[in-house]
Amino acid sequence: RTTTCFGDGCQNTASRCKNGGTWDGLKCQCPNLYYGELCEEVVSSIDIGPPETISAQMELTVTVTSVKFTEELKNHSSQEFQEFKQTFTEQMNIVYSGIPEYVGVNITKLRLGSVVVEHDVLLRTKYTPEYKTVLDNATEVVKEKITKVTTQQIMINDICSDMMCFNTTGTQVQNITVTQYDPEEDCRKMAKEYGDYFVVEYRDQKPYCISPCEPGFSVSKNCNLGKCQMSLSGPQCLCVTTETHWYSGETCNQGTQKSLVYGHHHHHH
């Protein structure tokens, strides 16, 4: 956030940039959390995303019995590996075709034992507050489907009647990693020393990191005709003075008519 300064007062402004702001010759360049001519104001909302999508990765092992292991399979640039990868990917795309979150597979290692395939199943879903549940459900369906196919597609009388055949007992789920996204934590971190006063509120399933000085949310502080300003002790209302009234009180809701005060003073004089 930047505020431009024109005229003779600018040199003075340069040395007065606050809160880590830097002078660029024309204006104070403010760090993310601040704005204003001197970076003296604290922002009332912080952009915390969310990411458009959340990913999960399942580390799986299956044993393919319809391909004979050779040392060439360890070399990822060999024709053996490339052809195996093509067929394995095609097979897995068929296995997981009913899972909307399924993105693909990535072979990490092939080793002896017919062919033991260490691979990742990649899942992705659009961000919603329920993303954990969505991905948890998807990982369960992956487990069911891979268990089913490795039980059904097996060699019978040394013949494989499918694209690939498997050893039923060679199927294992090693690890499941879901990209962590915690808007509350992100909000607290990005608000730094003001973290106690910033909260996450949702609108259209999107999280907003806001302080009570941001209008239009359930936590918003109503300063009436005053201005909400964030300080290290929390949000405060800075009350205004108009031509006719002084305003005071925690939410600037107490107005005193100047004429009454002046009249009162005049009466005393």
Partner: nanobody, 124 residues
Framework: EVQLVESGGGLVQPGRSLRLSCAAS???????MGWFRQAPGKEREGVAG???????GYADSVKGRFTISRDNAKNSLYLQMNSLRAEDTALYYC???????????????????RGQGTMVTVSS
Amino acid sequence: EVQLVESGGGLVQPGRSLRLSCAASGDITRRCMGWFRQAPGKEREGVAGISEDGITGYADSVKGRFTISRDNAKNSLYLQMNSLRAEDTALYYCAASILNRVGCRQLSYEYIYRGQGTMVTVSS
């Protein structure tokens, strides 16, 4: 990448014979090889398959009439077709599996490379 080119197709009378050949551009030694066919308006169908060590498999409709063979030294595959019938009319494709495929049979699941095909028409 393996390139496969079929030859030997043509018009033949019922009961006669035909020999199809398939020339491969690369080494086919460690591959299952096979033939499948597609008749006009019908689904693709596995005809015959042969493993790298010469074990063969056939579709029920061609058993006893067709013979698949391979010549690894020449990188070639053959299909000897005897006692041809009108229902054998189709486009015949040669196919190759991934390297080191085991447990082959005549169906086409295991094949990742295939040729353009050669037309066989059985008609009197």
